[in-house]
C-alpha cells in the first residue's frame, strides 16, 4: 500500500506566520458573492483557497496564491529561489500522487520525481496530499528545477474541472430544465452585475442530487436546478434569496430591450 507522509510534517511544526493577521481564520464575510480568494491556514501552514463573500471579512485574504505565500509563509521567496536554482525542494514534492478519497475530477498538477517534471493529474476534491497544485506554474516554481526542464509550452489554462470530451457551454437544457434561448436574453452591456450570473446552469460532474438555484438572465429570475455535488460554475446558489441578491442587482431595467424584470 502507498502510505503518504502526514500533512503535519515535522518541519512545519515550529513555523510562525510573518504577520498577526496570517493567524486569523478564513472569513467569508456576510455578503453572498462567490469570489475565489486565498488565506493562510495556521493548521496546515499553507495558503489555501476559500470563497469570499465580497464584503467585510479580514486581512487574511489574498487575490492570488502567490501573494498569500509571499505575505504569510516565512522564507517562501527564498524557498522558491532555492527550488529554481536546483537546490532543495520541499519534502512534499516527493510525495506520490494521491487523488484523495472523493471523486470530483479536478485538474491539478503534481511533481513527478521519476520524470523530474510537473505533470497533470486528476484530483478527487478532498483530502489527498500536498503534492497538489492548482497551476502548472505554481508546481514548477516550487518543485521543478527549470535548469533541467525544457522551455515550458504556453498551456491554455483549462477550467478547474476535467470533463470527458467536449464541454458544451451554451446548453439549452440542463437537468430537464429548459433554459430559454430567446431574444430577451440581455446582451452583456445590459447586465452590469457579476459575470457568472450570465453563465448557464451547470449540474457538474458528480452523482449527487442537490437542490440549487441559478440566475436565468433571460427571465431575470432564479430557477431551481439539480447540482451533482462538484464541478459546475459560480452561477450556483444554495437558496433563491442568495441567488437574487447576488445577481438581480446587475440587471438594467430597460423596457425597450425586452428584459423581464
Amino acid at each position: 500500500l502507498s502510505e503518504e507522509a502526514d500533512d503535519t510534517d515535522s518541519e512545519l511544526g515550529s513555523m510562525k506566520p510573518l504577520h498577526t493577521f496570517c493567524a486569523m481564520k478564513a472569513d467569508d464575510g456576510p455578503c453572498k458573492a462567490m469570489i475565489r480568494s486565498y488565506f493562510f491556514n495556521m493548521y496546515t501552514h499553507q495558503c489555501e483557497e476559500f470563497i469570499y463573500g465580497g464584503c467585510e471579512g479580514n486581512e487574511n485574504r489574498f487575490d492570488t496564491l502567490e501573494e498569500c505565500k509571499k505575505t504569510c509563509i516565512p522564507g517562501y521567496e527564498k524557498t522558491a529561489v532555492k527550488a529554481a536554482s536546483g537546490a532543495e525542494r520541499p519534502d512534499f514534492c516527493f510525495l506520490e500522487e494521491d487523488p484523495g478519497l472523493c471523486r470530483g475530477y479536478m485538474k491539478r498538477y503534481l511533481y513527478n520525481n521519476q520524470t523530474k517534471q510537473c505533470e497533470r493529474f486528476v484530483y478527487g476534491g478532498c483530502l489527498g496530499n500536498r503534492n497538489n497544485f492548482e497551476t502548472l506554474d505554481e508546481c514548477k516554481k516550487i518543485c521543478e528545477n527549470p535548469v533541467h526542464s525544457p522551455s515550458p509550452v504556453n498551456e491554455v489554462q483549462m477550467s478547474d474541472y476535467v470533463t470527458d470530451g467536449n464541454t458544451v457551454t451554451d446548453r439549452s437544457t440542463v437537468n430537464n430544465i429548459v433554459v430559454p434561448q430567446s431574444p430577451k436574453v440581455p446582451r452583456r452591456r445590459d447586465y452590469r452585475g457579476r459575470p457568472w450570473c450570465l453563465q448557464p446552469a451547470d449540474s457538474g460532474l458528480c452523482k449527487a442530487s442537490e437542490r440549487r438555484f441559478y440566475y436565468n438572465s433571460a427571465t431575470g429570475k432564479c430557477h431551481r436546478f439539480n447540482y451533482t455535488g462538484c464541478g459546475g460554475n459560480n452561477n450556483n446558489f444554495t437558496t433563491r434569496r442568495r441567488c437574487l441578491r447576488s445577481c438581480k442587482t446587475g440587471l438594467i431595467k430597460n423596457k425597450s430591450k425586452g428584459v423581464v424584470k
Epitope: S2, E3, D6, F39, R103, C126, E210, G229
Partner: antibody, heavy 123, light 112 residues
C-alpha cells in the same frame, strides 16, 4: 445494499495485537468509488478515526498520527474484506471498533457501518 | 487536528417541537460553490452511527425531511423541525477538510 460484517476477538491482552476483519457484501473492496475505514468509540475519546484504505489504480492508505506507529489496515481482494491490526495494545485501546465505508461518489461520507465490536484490553 | 465542538452536549426535547444542534470547527470547512466538508451522523441507542447530512446541507438517502443542515465556514447547525420519538440518540458532526478526519464530541438528544 451494502453490508459490513465485523469479526474478531473481544478480549486482547496488553502488549498483544488486536486483529479485526470486516467482510463486505454489496460492494467491492477495490471499488474506485469507495474507501474503507476503521473508527473506534470509547467514553473517554468519543468517535476516533483510525485510518482508511482506498483503491485508485493502486492502493493508498492514511492513518491517524495517534496510532500510526502501531496500525495496519490491509485489503483482501480474494475474500472481499479488509482488516485492522493494532499492535502493542494497552487498556486505553479498549473501545467499540467499527468498520465503515466512505462513499466517494455521491455522499462523501461514511454511509455504511459495521455492527461494531467491543474490544477489551485486559490481562 | 481540526477540533469539532458541539453544543449543547445534552438536549432534552418534546415530541413535535423543533430542536437545534450547533457544531463549530477550529478552521473553515468551506471548499467552494457553497460546499462545506462537514457531515452529520445519528447514533441511535445500541446501534452504529448512520449518515444523516453530507456536505453540510444535503440529506442522505432515506433521511426524513424534518432533518436539515445549514451553516458555512466554521459554524454549522443541524435542525429537526418536529422531533419524533425515534430521533433520540447521539448526534455527531464530522469534518473531512484535512486528515485526521475528526468528529464532534456528540450531542445526546432525549425525550423530556
Amino acid at each position: 445494499e451494502v453490508q459490513l460484517q465485523q469479526s474478531g476477538p473481544g478480549l486482547v491482552k496488553p502488549s498483544q495485537t488486536l486483529s479485526l476483519t470486516c467482510a463486505i457484501s454489496g460492494d467491492s473492496v477495490s471499488s474506485d468509488s469507495a474507501a474503507w475505514s476503521w473508527i473506534r468509540q470509547s467514553p473517554s475519546r468519543g468517535l476516533e478515526w483510525l485510518g482508511i484504505i482506498y483503491y485508485r489504480s493502486k492502493w493508498y492508505n492514511r492513518y491517524a498520527v495517534s496510532v500510526k506507529s502501531r496500525i495496519t489496515i490491509n485489503p483482501d481482494t480474494s475474500k472481499n474484506q479488509f482488516s485492522l491490526q493494532l499492535n502493542s495494545v494497552t487498556p486505553e485501546d479498549t473501545a467499540v471498533y467499527y468498520c465503515a465505508r466512505w462513499h466517494s461518489d455521491k455522499h462523501w461520507g461514511f454511509d455504511d457501518w459495521g455492527q461494531g465490536t467491543l474490544v477489551t484490553v485486559s490481562s | 487536528d481540526i477540533v469539532m465542538t458541539q453544543s449543547p452536549l445534552s438536549l432534552p426535547v418534546t415530541p413535535g417541537e423543533p430542536a437545534s444542534i450547533s457544531c463549530r470547527s477550529s478552521q473553515s470547512l468551506l471548499f467552494r460553490f457553497g460546499i462545506n466538508y462537514l457531515n452529520w451522523y445519528l447514533q441511535k441507542p445500541g446501534q452504529s452511527p448512520q449518515l444523516l447530512i453530507y456536505k453540510g446541507s444535503n440529506r442522505a438517502s432515506g433521511v426524513p425531511d424534518r432533518f436539515s443542515g445549514s451553516g458555512s465556514g466554521t459554524d454549522f447547525t443541524l435542525k429537526i423541525s418536529r422531533v419524533e420519538a425515534e430521533d433520540v440518540g447521539v448526534y455527531y458532526c464530522q469534518q473531512y477538510t484535512s486528515y485526521p478526519l475528526t468528529f464532534g464530541q456528540g450531542t445526546k438528544v432525549e425525550i423530556k
